[in-house]
């Protein structure tokens, strides 16, 4: 009956962790004698190829300085301890502790058997490192030029993590990769870039990090912060200002980052009705008169700059009742 070596084609282990490389001689054959089990790295330099051996009488040895006995062990193999006990070498599973990048590669498990000869199986050991992820907004100021408004960093992954962004904005990403402080790892930085405007301020974008050590992608929300000058509009004019009206108000509506520091109400004609009183963002009109036939201007300032809006006012002789009945009911 033929024997075969059962190994996994690929085994993944975490950098710094412990991994087991399974190796079994199958099936159990009566009278088959295993004279030696060896683990080799066929791609290593000649003097480092034989990393571990298990002899039925002598037990384990680790004939390569790397990884060496302090990081290698046989999980189940047992040597003969005298006349009464048979060596148990069918399970030659090798444990590798404190994984380093240099441990990655092909490993061959070989059984020297009598009378069948040598049989072997090969396993590819991949060393992976789970990256640490973070994302943060960059405080930027309104500009005409594309600027990095958010960073997503995946630190010390092996292989490098894949970073993408989820957003409805008009953006592009710029990625850089540098070696991590842990040998063989890579830190990936993705810069979320756009032309920063008020439209982007307060918008949440999502950094998506994918890595084979994650069960599912990491999703990290980032709220953008763009400093921009006030964007101003005026509300409150209903096209029904008539002489003598007393309940009129104009509001200066502002979006800005940071908050406005001042409001200024003026007219384009240069004359300002005495019955109009500026109260911050509001212009309260006590009584409409003919001087209100003008264009009101609200100018708002913040730490970044200034914004303004205009509202043309048409003063009627009498109230406009044409739409009143319809809108009322």
């Amino acid at each position: 009956q033929d024997v075969r070596v059962q190994v996994l084609p690929e085994v993944r282990g975490q950098l710094g962790g412990t991994v087991e490389l399974p190796c079994h001689l199958l099936p159990p054959v009566p009278g088959l004698y295993i004279s030696l089990v060896t683990w080799q790295r066929p791609d290593a330099p000649a003097n480092h190829q034989n990393v571990a051996a298990f002899h039925p009488k002598m037990g384990p040895s680790f004939p390569s300085p790397k990884p060496g006995s302090e990081r290698l062990s046989f999980v189940s193999a047992k040597q003969s301890t005298g006349q009464d006990t048979e060596a148990e070498l069918q399970d030659a599973t090798l444990a590798l502790h404190g994984l380093t990048v240099e441990d990655e590669g092909n490993y061959t498990c070989e059984f020297a058997t009598f009378p069948k000869g040598s049989v072997r199986g090969m396993t590819w050991l991949r060393v992976i490192a789970k990256p640490k992820n973070q994302a943060e907004a960059q405080k930027v100021t309104f500009s005409q030029d594309p600027t990095t408004v958010a960073l997503c960093i995946s630190k010390e992954g092996r292989p490098p993590a894949r970073i993408s962004w989820l957003s409805s904005l008009d953006w592009e990403a710029k990625e850089t990769q540098v070696s991590g402080t842990l040998a063989g790892t890579v830190t990936v930085t993705s810069r979320f870039t756009l032309v920063p405007s008020g439209r982007a301020d307060g918008v949440t974008v999502t950094c998506k990090v994918e890595h084979e050590s994650f069960e599912e992608p990491a999703l990290i929300p980032v709220t953008l912060s763009v400093r921009y000058p006030p964007e101003v509009s005026i509300s409150g004019y209903d096209d029904n200002w008539y002489l003598g009206r007393t309940d009129a108000t104009l509001s200066c509506d502002v979006r800005s980052n940071p908050e406005p520091t001042g409001y200024d109400w003026s007219t384009t004609s240069g004359t300002f009705p005495t019955s109009a009183v500026a109260q911050g963002s509001q212009l309260v009109i006590h009584a409409v008169d003919s001087l209100f036939n003008t264009t009101f201007v609200c100018t708002v300032t913040n730490a970044v700059g200034m914004g303004r809006a205009e509202q043309v006012i048409f003063v009627r002789e009498t109230p406009n009742t044409a739409g009143a009945g319809a809108t009322g009911g």
Epitope: H55, K57, E70
Partner: antibody
């Protein structure tokens, strides 16, 4: 670089115990099996015994009871318990590789047993 | 006990190919190794695992194994190859571990 060097070889009278020491450099003795081999003048190589990575010992059938092998973290000792004139030889220590081949040897130390 | 037999001496002409044999009295369960020893020096490993050559050993030296005989072949023999050659293997068939050397072959290179 990895190396082995034997010491302690000298002229002794029959029956006087003698200990030879193999000092290793660049070798982790908990990873390797270590052997003692001897060669009488003009004769062939003769294996004496082995101490395992995990410190178990085996001896040639003719050597059992006449020799004792032990080790520390940097040395492997061979004690000749009661030498006879037939024990006159050059004594080598040698390291076993993964296939039990002796892949590194010391230069040897000469032991002369004479009355 | 396990015995390895080698011819006591072999001659080869310079540049010729020579084969040194090593025969076990019972079928070996283990790999054969070959060692070269020059006068006044420690032995040097030439071949292990029947056929493998350590780094630094010229590829003129090769090993093979069939049944209970291991063979060391030296092609293009050089004057510097004049030495004693020992085969060896480990024997774990009994309750003990034994490492066994053959008696050695003295190789003389003539011409």
């Amino acid at each position: 670089a990895q190396s082995l060097e034997e010491s302690g070889g000298r002229l002794v009278t029959p029956g006087t115990p003698l200990t030879l020491t193999c000092t290793v450099s660049g070798i982790d003795l908990s990873s390797y099996h270590m052997n003692w081999v001897r060669q009488a003048p003009g004769k062939g190589l003769e294996w004496i015994g082995i101490i395992g990575a995990s410190a178990g010992t085996y001896y040639a059938r003719w050597a059992k009871g006449r020799f004792t092998i032990s080790k520390t973290s940097t040395t492997v000792d061979l004690k000749i318990t009661s030498p006879t004139t037939e024990d006159t030889a050059t004594y080598f220590c040698a390291r076993s590789g993964g296939s039990m081949q002796l892949n590194l040897w010391g230069p040897g130390t000469l032991v002369t047993i004479s009355s | 006990s396990f015995v390895l037999t080698q011819p006591a001496s072999v001659q080869v002409n310079l540049g010729q190919t020579v084969s040194l044999t090593c025969t076990a009295d019972t079928l070996s369960r283990s790999y054969a190794s070959w060692y070269q020893q020059k006068p006044g020096q420690a032995p040097v490993l030439l071949i292990y695992r029947d056929t493998s050559r350590p780094s630094g050993v010229p590829d003129r030296f090769s090993g093979s194994s069939s049944g209970n005989t291991a063979t060391l072949t030296i092609s293009g023999a050089q004057a510097g190859d004049e030495a004693d050659y020992y085969c060896a293997t480990d024997d774990s068939s009994g309750s003990s571990y034994q490492y066994v050397f053959g008696g050695g072959t003295q190789l003389t290179v003539t011409g």
